[in-house]
């Protein structure tokens, strides 16, 4: 009775992992493991208090993970990187907005390369590989008082526990600091066979 | 022994729905609830018969939900808003295309701000919050007879039953009315723990 | 008997594919079928060794499916098309990057239409329908030595076994051949009720 009730509460309609539990009948064990191994996800929004100043490609290390729309579960955010805790196939995405208003000052150059790179780093093999890139060259002339441009990228990738996802952009000082503007995330879709 | 071992190896952590049924054996109950609680989704395509004029930001209220690529299940479309019926984490997306041909007449201004905002409204707290935004400032000069621009945004959000998703755009009269061009949607990825 | 029949009809191919197996105890049968019917996906990256020339709209037929980030499971890649093997609702996406450097020579025109079209073809009814489109008109002037632009589209669609997904672009000779730049993919989210 109590065990079944607890199971219904925890398992709910989660996508649960049958494995051992179904075979040997240890339902409580299943329930506990189901809770622990729920599908990982993250939605991280830009923390604009610490954005680099250059116009070159830089790794963005300051992201919120627990305020506003930002959230994380069964993944870890550390040192500016999103760390995978559970092997699987994930859908990764990023939305990056750049903006300039004439009140912010004169642009050093009107010809801009506004880019995003979503990269994967493996601790075992300490090298970084770009999974997705996007962006545009833009001519932001002084004829207009306001300029804006957004990039969206997304793709489906196999990620292993311990691998790290990070985001690099050019012209970081042009980033739009709103949580609805500049963010990236991931959610697990399925296990690796 | 051997059968169980093989099962553990093959089934692994497949995503299944155990719920109450597996515990107390009420399979028909599982079946019914499974049908009722199938993962919600929606893909709504623009209904161009009723697009507002002007260049200001407006909420788009006319969308198809049941013709062509448009479809909806376990969500509701009402009063121009996509209503959540089932708590969960959803992937939301929008694709918005703007276009202008010189045969449509002269633009009021050649400097345009082409934007999309995907917003969430809670009936309990009647305020609107932008989940995602994207777009670009564009210079659509008279030197070219045709202009086109598309925006794509996507992200992973926690939605509660009763919350409403809507789409706002600037320059709605420039929207491309094709179903493959201007649409938004959502699909549930997982339950809330 | 009747209960089992009703169960098979309602649950259909829901996430658990329990059906006969769970009812009559044939666990090994379930395990085998579960393995075979794991959620399909594909992530295909551009094979730039065979990109068409010209500026017109062309179907891209050369994609990698098994090197680098490219992968496929329970779907088929054949004759430049991604073939659906399992009915379901899928999230489809594409990321297309265009670029030009002055060292590549002069562009035939500085006014470009950079577009992507993701299309569905049904073998039963041999006609092609565009599911998603995106892009932009661009003015790539000789004042800048380098130009870049990326498009991202994504959406949720019902696909039947045997249907084919393909990608068309304008100005294929401007495509960025990197695997992180030009790709498309799909993953199954849920069964058809």
């Amino acid at each position: 009775g109590a065990v079944q009730k607890e199971l219904q509460h925890i398992v709910g309609s989660q996508h649960i992992r049958a494995e051992k539990a179904m075979v040997d009948g240890s339902w409580l064990d299943l329930a506990k493991r189901s809770k622990l191994e729920a599908q990982p996800f993250a939605h991280l929004t830009i923390n604009a208090t610490d954005i680099p100043t250059g116009s070159h490609k830089v790794s963005l290390s300051s992201w919120y993970h627990d305020r506003g729309w930002a959230k994380i579960s069964n993944m870890t955010f550390s040192n500016g990187k999103l760390i995978v805790n559970q092997d699987g196939f994930y859908y990764l995405y990023a939305n990056i907005c750049f903006r300039h208003h004439e009140t912010s000052g004169d642009l050093a150059t009107e010809y801009l390369q506004l880019m995003v790179y979503v990269t994967k780093t493996s601790i075992k093999i300490p090298s970084s590989h770009t999974l997705m890139k996007g962006g545009s060259t833009k001519y932001w002339s002084g004829n207009s008082e306001f300029h804006f441009y957004s990039i969206n990228v997304g793709g489906f990738f196999k990620l292993r526990s311990g691998e790290e996802i990070s985001v690099e952009v050019s012209n970081p000082s042009l980033l739009d600091p709103d949580q609805d503007a500049t963010y990236f995330g991931a959610f697990k879709v399925r296990d690796i066979d | 022994g051997a059968v169980q071992k093989e099962l553990q190896h093959i089934v692994g952590s497949q995503h299944i729905r155990a719920e109450k049924a597996m515990v107390d054996g009420s399979w028909l109950d599982l079946a019914k609830r499974s049908k009722l609680e199938a993962q919600p989704f929606a893909h709504l395509t623009i209904n161009a018969t009723d697009i507002p004029t002007g260049s200001h930001k407006v909420s788009l209220s006319s969308w198809y939900h049941d013709r062509g690529w448009a479809k909806i299940s376990n969500m509701t479309f009402s009063n121009g808003k996509l209503i959540v019926n089932q708590d969960g984490f959803y992937y939301l997306y929008a694709n918005i295309c703007f276009r202008h041909h010189e045969t449509s007449g002269d633009l009021a201004t050649e400097y345009l701000q082409l934007m999309v905002y995907v917003t969430k409204t809670s009936i309990k707290i009647p305020s609107s919050h932008t989940l995602m935004k994207g777009g670009s400032t564009k210079y659509w000069s008279g030197n070219s007879e045709f202009h086109f621009y598309s925006i794509n945004v996507g992200g992973f959000f926690k939605l509660r039953s009763g919350e409403e998703i809507s789409v706002e755009v600037s320059n709605p009269s420039l929207l491309d009315p094709d179903q493959d061009a201007t649409y938004f949607g959502a699909f549930k990825v997982r339950d809330i723990d | 008997g009747a209960v089992q029949k009703e169960l098979q009809h309602i649950v259909g191919s829901q996430h658990i594919r329990a059906e006969k197996a769970m009812v009559d105890g044939s666990w090994l049968d379930l395990a085998k079928r579960s393995k075979l019917e794991a959620q399909p996906f594909a992530h295909l990256t551009i094979n730039a060794t065979d990109i068409p020339t010209g500026s017109h709209k062309v179907s891209l037929s050369s994609w990698y499916h098994d090197r680098g980030w490219a992968k496929i499971s329970n779907m088929t890649f054949s004759n430049g098309k991604l073939i659906v093997n399992q009915d379901g609702f899928y999230y489809l996406y594409a990321n297309i990057c265009f670029r030009h450097h002055e060292t590549s020579g002069d562009l035939a025109t500085e006014y470009l239409q950079l577009m992507v079209y993701v299309t569905k073809t049904s073998i039963k009814i041999p006609s092609s329908h565009t599911l998603m489109k995106g892009g932009s008109t661009k003015y790539w002037s000789g004042n800048s030595e380098f130009h870049f632009y990326s498009i991202n589209v994504g959406g949720f669609f019902k696909l039947r076994s045997g249907e084919e997904i393909s990608v068309e672009v304008s100005n294929p000779s401007l495509l960025d051949p990197d695997q992180d730049a030009t790709y498309f993919g799909a993953f199954k989210v849920r069964d058809i009720d």
């Epitope: 100043t53 250059g54 116009s55 070159h56 490609k57 830089v58 912010s104 000052g105 004169d106 642009l107 050093a108 150059t109 009107e110 010809y111 012209n171 000082s173 042009l174 | - | -």
Partner: antibody, heavy 121, light 107 residues
Amino acid sequence: QVQLVESGGGVVQPGRSLRLSCAASGFTFGGYGMHWVRQAPGKGLEWVAVISYDGNNKYYADSVKGRFTISRDNSKNTLYLQMNSLRAEDTAVYYCAKCLSGTYWGYGMDGWGQGTTVTVS
Amino acid sequence: DIQMTQSPSTLSASVGDRVTITCRASQSISNWLAWYQQKPGKAPKLLIYKASSLESGVPSRFSGSGSGTEFTLTISSLQPDDFATYYCQQYNNYSWTFGQGTKVEIK
């Protein structure tokens, strides 16, 4: 740690040319605009020229316009100042300086070299 | 070109004193003003940018204020290391100019 090392200074006759170099390290050189600033003996600082991070935009003080040319080679992390038609009033210590912001002008110069002396006589 | 006028040219003060240096622009420069410190035989060092933003690593006793045409640099409690020459520098419309400098010396 930003490091800027100027070289190429020396004694030169009026009307002749000189080319100054500034070797940069400790930061991503290609991401920042760079200035040349000079200081005549016992005098204050005088701005000379600036170049954007990509080399596309260059601006000069009126006093050197048409005679001096600023350039950069991002692959070599080096800034240059080509000085032609030198005059006695160009005698100064020449500093290269890094822009605080790579994207915007006006944020100040947050890294300076130790300077190289140019004497025109 | 915009002219920058600093005052005073020389300032005599003691350790612990509160010191204020003024910089006036010949026309409005919004907040596009920086302050530098230079010691004899050394390169200048950035203290303040955008009129009031403290450069990383600079002691908090330094502060800047003002906008438009009137700007001030304040040292709240003068330290032995602060005896030097201070320059303001403006940016406007792709042109940079420095003030003539203010020498802060020991009283």
